[in-house]
Amino acid sequence: MVPPPENVRMNSVNFKNILQWESPAFAKGNLTFTAQYLSYRIFQDKCMNTTLTECDFSSLSKYGDHTLRVRAEFADEHSDWVNITFCPVDDTIIGPPGMQVEVLADSLHMRFLAPKIENEYETWTMKNVYNSWTYNVQYWKNGTDEKFQITPQYDFEVLRNLEPWTTYCVQVRGFLPDRNKAGEWSEPVCEQTTHDETVPS
């Protein structure tokens, strides 16, 4: 009897949908695996007789529930199927946006870039998929614990009237208000402000 794959799960970030599993202990030799998806009531092969423990399902429709399954094989024997259901638009993890930061005197000028999507045109981003897409920004003085959060209305934001000659750190994430779903924070970007622009009278 061939044991089934273990710890079967979907790892999906920005619609890069990778079905992953672990190979069970099997004394007779090396196992191979076949992964399938349900399409119009028929299961279709996606990865056949692979020695890998993952299979790329990024070409699935972003919409709807998908049934995926994987089994282990050895010679002419095979395990039972292990099934999972997956809805990309609901289940995919929102990866960190890009961010460009520029210091202008005592201000930080930030521009945000929505995450790109696997198997899409360069210009079709997570912002196109989710109508309610917005950004959360948090910033803090480097070396302090107090963080401030803002929700920019646009793809850019300016933090004004900051303390001069002080290092501020900023990070951004995508947020979907209608789903109350937050994405992953970007890596902090830390920049030092320069002089206060106000001219003494």
Epitope: S59, N119, N128
Partner: nanobody, 124 residues
Framework: EVQLVESGGGLVQPGGSLRLSCAAS????????IGWFRQAPGKGLEGVSC????????HYADSVKGRFTISRDNSKNTLYLQMNSLRAEDTAVYYC?????????????????WGQGTQVTVSS
């Protein structure tokens, strides 16, 4: 059942132009996303371009950027693909497709309705 009907294909010399049209028979083309795909002889389906209804944004494959322009005329319920500076490698059957959910642009899996296609041949 929605039927999409493409027209405007034909034989054109390299460097020439064509304008493809797509209409929905008896229906409006009021879908969140409408796109053009193509299939060259012996190859798979390839996304060419799409237009999003929500913000009228247009999106293109790298291979056609700057040469092809997608547009829609809501008053005529028609989608267009203006193809300029055509090359031999643009030879394919071109399909119009519409998505009910509008979540994707390039992947054929994200589209629900398809036309029968119109042949474009670029040859001297």
């Amino acid at each position: 059942e929605v039927q999409l009907v493409e027209s405007g294909g034909g034989l054109v010399q390299p460097g020439g132009s064509l304008r493809l049209s797509c209409a929905a028979s008896g229906n409006s083309l009021d879908y969140p996303t409408i796109g053009w795909f193509r299939q060259a002889p012996g190859k798979g389906l390839e996304g060419v371009s799409c237009i999003s209804a929500s913000d009228a944004s247009t999106h293109y494959a790298d291979s056609v950027k700057g040469r092809f322009t997608i547009s829609r005329d809501n008053s005529k319920n028609t989608l267009y693909l203006q193809m300029n500076s055509l090359r031999a490698e643009d030879t394919a059957v071109y399909y119009c497709a519409a998505s009910l959910h509008g979540l994707g642009c390039k992947s054929e899996a994200d589209y629900d309705y398809w036309g029968q296609g119109t042949q474009v041949t670029v040859s001297s």
